[in-house]
């Protein structure tokens, strides 16, 4: 059973992930972002189901494409280089979902834009955080 300290750690990691995703979304939605039109042409895949930490596998598998999209944006829109930002997110996601269990992600049929994709995972983080508090 999860201890209060492990729950707190999970909550903090989710909050960190949430802030990173929100920062990316804000950077992309910046009205000065000249690459937004092109960014919106990139297709992202959404999970059929995202209710547990193991479903973060679906986010992890989209982090490569996410890094490529962020490479299009002006670096000043973000505090970190895309490579470093995605590296940080990968560390958090790996700690949250664990590396031992090999969960195969199931994707929804419909693809999403980067904005829809980020909003989906922001909602996921908020939902899990709310169950922990």
């Amino acid at each position: 059973a999860p201890t209060s300290s492990s729950t707190k750690k999970t909550q903090l990691q989710l909050e960190h992930l949430l802030l990173d995703l929100q920062m990316i979304l804000n950077g992309i939605n910046n009205y000065k972002n000249p690459k937004l039109t092109r960014m919106l042409t990139f297709k992202f895949y959404m999970p059929k189901k995202a209710t547990e930490l193991k479903h973060l596998q679906c986010l992890e598998e989209e982090l490569g494409p996410l890094e490529e999209v962020l490479n299009l944006a002006q670096s000043k829109n973000f505090h970190l280089r895309p490579r470093d930002l995605i590296s940080n997110i990968r560390v958090i996601v790996l700690e949250l979902k664990g590396s031992e269990t090999t969960f195969m992600c199931e994707y929804a049929d419909e693809t999403a834009t980067i904005v829809e994709f980020l909003n989906r995972w922001i909602t996921f983080c908020q939902s899990i955080i709310s169950t922990l508090t």
Epitope: F42, Q57, E60, G64, S99, Y107
Partner: antibody, heavy 123, light 107 residues
């Protein structure tokens, strides 16, 4: 169906420069990141680098930096890979291949390949 | 750089037999691994992507699996046209790296 057609075989002397082309047909080149991979005779595959033809941004493998230049001409849907200061170890078949994030998940991998261009470096 | 180690270097089997090819990553790469088949004088052909997904036009006898940093390509029942060299590739981070290859030959 996307096809990649590469230029013909080249024979070069050590120290020379070679420039190989890769023409995309069946779609526009700007939909793809164009990658280059090489294979020495009887050896495995080695990633050289890639270009985003939309904005000409490039990424190169560390061991090719300074010697390789990847470019693209969107008006002709053609990518180029130029390798300078050639040495005998550069004798290999050079392939262009693609990645795209605009279509299916499968096409995020090296799904389309050129037929390969043999570059022979010999004195 | 991420190193991919393929084993065995050569696998000698007969048509109809089951082939199991291994690829081990030097660090965690999630499912960012694909498998390619290459025949002499030809370009590589994508077989499996994202560790377990079958590429379009590839027969169902090919399958991929993953356990941690260990990846496996299985050919359930070998056909004569399956004898070739197989490579794994990681897309987790640049530089993208390939395994050294496994040659599948007729016994």
């Amino acid at each position: 169906q996307v096809q990649l057609v590469q230029s013909g075989a080249e024979v070069k002397k050590p120290g020379a420069t070679v420039k190989i082309s890769c023409k995309v047909s069946g779609d526009t080149i700007t939909a793809y990141y164009m990658h280059w991979v090489r294979q020495a005779p009887g050896q495995g595959l080695e990633w050289i680098g890639r270009i985003d033809p939309e904005d000409d941004s490039t990424k190169y493998a560390e061991n090719f930096k300074g010697r390789v230049t990847i470019t693209a001409d969107t008006s002709t849907d053609t990518a180029y890979m130029e390798l300078s200061s050639l040495r005998s170890e550069d004798t290999a078949v050079y392939y262009c291949t693609t990645i795209t994030f605009l279509y299916t998940r499968e096409l995020r991998w090296f799904a389309y390949w050129g037929q390969g261009t043999l570059v022979t470096v010999s004195s | 750089d991420i190193v991919l180690t393929q084993s065995p270097a050569t696998l000698s089997l007969s048509p109809g037999e089951r082939a199991t090819l291994s690829c081990q990553a030097s660090q965690y790469i999630s499912n960012y691994l694909s498998w390619y088949q290459q025949k002499p004088g030809q370009a590589p052909r994508l077989l499996i992507y994202s560790a377990t997904s079958l590429a379009s036009g590839i027969p169902a006898r090919f399958s991929g699996s993953r356990s941690g940093t260990d990846f496996t390509l299985t050919i359930s029942s070998l056909e004569p046209e399956d004898f070739a060299v197989y490579y794994c590739l990681q897309h987790y981070s640049t530089p993208y790296t390939f395994g050294q290859g496994t040659k599948l030959e007729i016994k």
